[in-house]
Interface confidence: low
């Protein structure tokens, strides 16, 4: 949508054309929730709060209102050669039950953050890729953004400053138009060690690299497949030990929660990866809250007391839209003596390569 701020004589000083997606963490009666929603088409510029600023005393600001009391504000500043969105702030009203169902508090919250949105004076800022601004409990993602402040003639300049994300890196070709083809393949994920302990000692030892393979529909109706590596340095692991179920819970970037459940077949004394559950946010997706689960898997199997090892990349299909690529996996569940891996049971893929 296009948002315009004009001065007293009707000349535009700010023009902004973008779509925005909001991801808000808030507290409900049953625990924290993440709500994602788009800037609605009926969002309006708040004329009495927006301003072109006054020479040397105040800076221009664009205030956009929607829903029951939500406002998104872009505060601009400039120096001799460049201007920027110095501060983005978002005010949201937790009593808006449409956007924040079951919120346990009904107060109005304000969050704000500096941004990377900047351009040369007399050039428009252009960013086709998503521009994310992280604030406390809120992430705002601007898509297909054209923004310009300190306008001289009530229209966007022909020249533009492109955002970093839109610029081709030295090793890649210029960005292609959106298509159903997969994203560029990232490097193999880093291998990390995970362990889960309970009152009776360690019940899970795992060493592996994890890559999420997600297929989803974007807002522009194209289907995209993305490969996302789980970065061990930005992941916190926890879990639980049970007689019949061992869980490994990984909290990673972008409110990603990946849950592994290992089960045991008592009659054959074998453990196996029984379930995988994923909750994550994909800002460019038509439905940004991506969830997938399958609790009837039979992967990574070995005898209890032994460990399962596979150097070859393993693909575990969770749903039609989600699979996990597991690299250099070495895992042992339920019975782990002395915190060490037991006798190794190699995967078939490795045996065939020997």
């Amino acid at each position: 949508a296009m948002f315009i701020v004009k001065n007293g004589n009707g000349t535009a000083c700010i023009m902004a054309n973008f779509s925005a997606a909001f991801s808000v963490n808030y507290d409900t009666k049953s625990g924290p929730k993440n709500m994602t929603f788009d800037l609605p088409s009926d969002a309006k510029v708040v004329l009495n709060s927006s301003s072109c600023g006054k020479e040397n005393t105040s800076d221009p600001s664009l205030v956009i209102a929607f829903g029951r009391g939500q406002t998104l504000t872009l505060n601009f500043t400039r120096n001799a050669t460049r201007y920027s969105v110095q501060l983005m702030s978002f005010v949201y009203n937790l009593s808006d039950t449409h956007l924040f169902p079951n919120a346990s508090s009904k107060e109005i919250k304000t969050v704000e953050s500096i941004t990377d949105i900047r351009a040369d004076i007399d050039k428009k800022y252009r960013c086709v890729s998503g521009t994310q601004v992280h604030m406390n409990n809120v992430t705002v993602t601007l898509h297909d953004a054209t923004i310009q402040a300190y306008l001289s003639n009530s229209s966007f300049s022909r020249e533009e400053t492109r955002c970093e994300q839109d610029r081709p890196s030295p090793t890649t070709a210029p960005p292609a138009p959106p298509s159903p083809s997969p994203s560029p393949v990232p490097e193999s994920p880093s291998v990390d060690k995970y362990n889960v302990s309970g009152t009776n000692g360690t019940c899970l030892l795992a060493s592996m690299g994890l890559q999420l393979n997600l297929t989803y529909e974007r807002k522009d109706n194209t289907t995209v497949t993305r490969l996302l590596n789980i970065n061990p340095n930005k992941t916190l692991a926890s879990g639980s030990c049970g007689a019949h179920l061992v869980t490994l819970e990984l909290h990673s970037e972008g409110s990603t929660v990946l849950l592994f459940q290992f089960g045991m077949n008592a009659s054959s004394s074998r453990f196996f990866l029984q379930g995988i559950q994923l909750n994550t946010t994909l800002p460019d997706a038509r439905d940004p809250a991506f969830k997938a689960a399958n609790s009837s898997l039979r992967a990574l199997q070995a005898t209890v007391g032994n460990s399962y090892k596979c150097n070859a990349e393993e693909h575990v299909r969770v749903t039609k839209a989600f699979s996990v690529n597991i690299f250099k996996v070495w895992v042992q569940a339920f019975k782990v003596e002395g915190g060490q891996f037991g006798s190794v049971e190699e995967c078939l893929l490795d045996e065939n390569n020997m």
């Epitope: 507290d27 009666k29 924290p32 079951n102 916190l236 909290h251």
Partner: antibody, heavy 118, light 106 residues
Framework: QVQLVQSGAELVKPGASVKMSCKAS????????IHWVRQAPGQGLEWIGA????????PYAQKFQGRATLTADTSSSTTYMELSSLTSEDTAVYYC???????????WGQGTLVTVSS | DIQMTQSPSSLSASVGGKVTITCKAS??????MAWYQQKPGKGPKLLIH???TLQPGVPSRFSGSGSGRDYSLTISSLEPEDIATYYC????????FGGGTKLEIK
């Protein structure tokens, strides 16, 4: 492994206040509510309140509004509960509890026994 | 605050028998109901959440049902280790426990 470790037993006089702690580990502290529940000897469970360390929001049961105060220190992943104007009826085991995703109370601390006696 | 009325407050049943405990909320709680088991000297243990979802490791003889204001916990075939006090909990609007049901073996 999610763990909630509570501070030790307290013996306090009527009219005084008590402040107990609950140190969390094994998960991202700011992502989950911590609830406080008490159980008087031979009695049932009573919900006191909760705090979401991510933003400090803290709803309370009507009965404890104004008398219980929940706070969270994110640097040490510790939640505190202070209860004021104590009477003998406040003698109880006080539990801190973490909600697990949308599941109700799934992880419990070991409890802190508070005895109010002159 | 929502009030929870749990009944009976105590009951005696035979091993192998079927047991049902009920909880009534003072208003619609939209299936945000959980059930706990507490054995003497121990902390409570979560059995069921979201009215009918069994926690991992909880025997299948336990089941939960209900909607609106009325909810129940059923033990289909009582085992000696099921002797405990059971509590319901609503978590739709703030949180409230029921008064508890003490279960004994006949």
């Amino acid at each position: 492994q999610v763990q909630l470790v509570q501070s030790g037993a307290e013996l306090v006089k009527p009219g005084a206040s008590v402040k107990m702690s609950c140190k969390a580990s094994g998960y991202i502290f700011t992502n989950y509510n911590i609830h406080w529940v008490r159980q008087a000897p031979g009695q049932g469970l009573e919900w006191i309140g909760a705090i979401y360390p991510g933003n400090g929001d803290a709803p309370y049961a009507q009965k404890f509004q104004g008398r219980a105060t929940l706070t969270a220190d994110t640097s040490s992943s510790t939640t505190y509960m202070e209860l004021s104007s104590l009477t003998s009826e406040d003698t109880a085991v006080y539990y801190c509890v973490r909600a697990n995703w949308d599941v109700a109370f799934a992880y419990w601390g070991q409890g802190t026994l508070v005895t109010v006696s002159s | 605050d929502i009030q929870m009325t749990q009944s009976p407050s105590s009951l005696s049943a035979s091993v192998g028998g079927k047991v049902t405990i009920t909880c009534k909320a003072s208003q619609d709680i939209d299936r945000y109901m959980a059930w706990y088991q507490q054995k003497p000297g121990k902390g409570p243990k979560l059995l069921i959440h979201d009215t009918s979802t069994l926690q991992p490791g909880v025997p299948s003889r336990f089941s939960g049902s209900g909607s609106g204001r009325d909810y129940s916990l059923t033990i289909s075939s009582l085992e000696p280790e099921d002797i405990a006090t059971y509590y319901c909990l609503q978590y739709d609007n703030l949180w409230t426990f029921g008064g508890g049901t003490k279960l004994e073996i006949k």
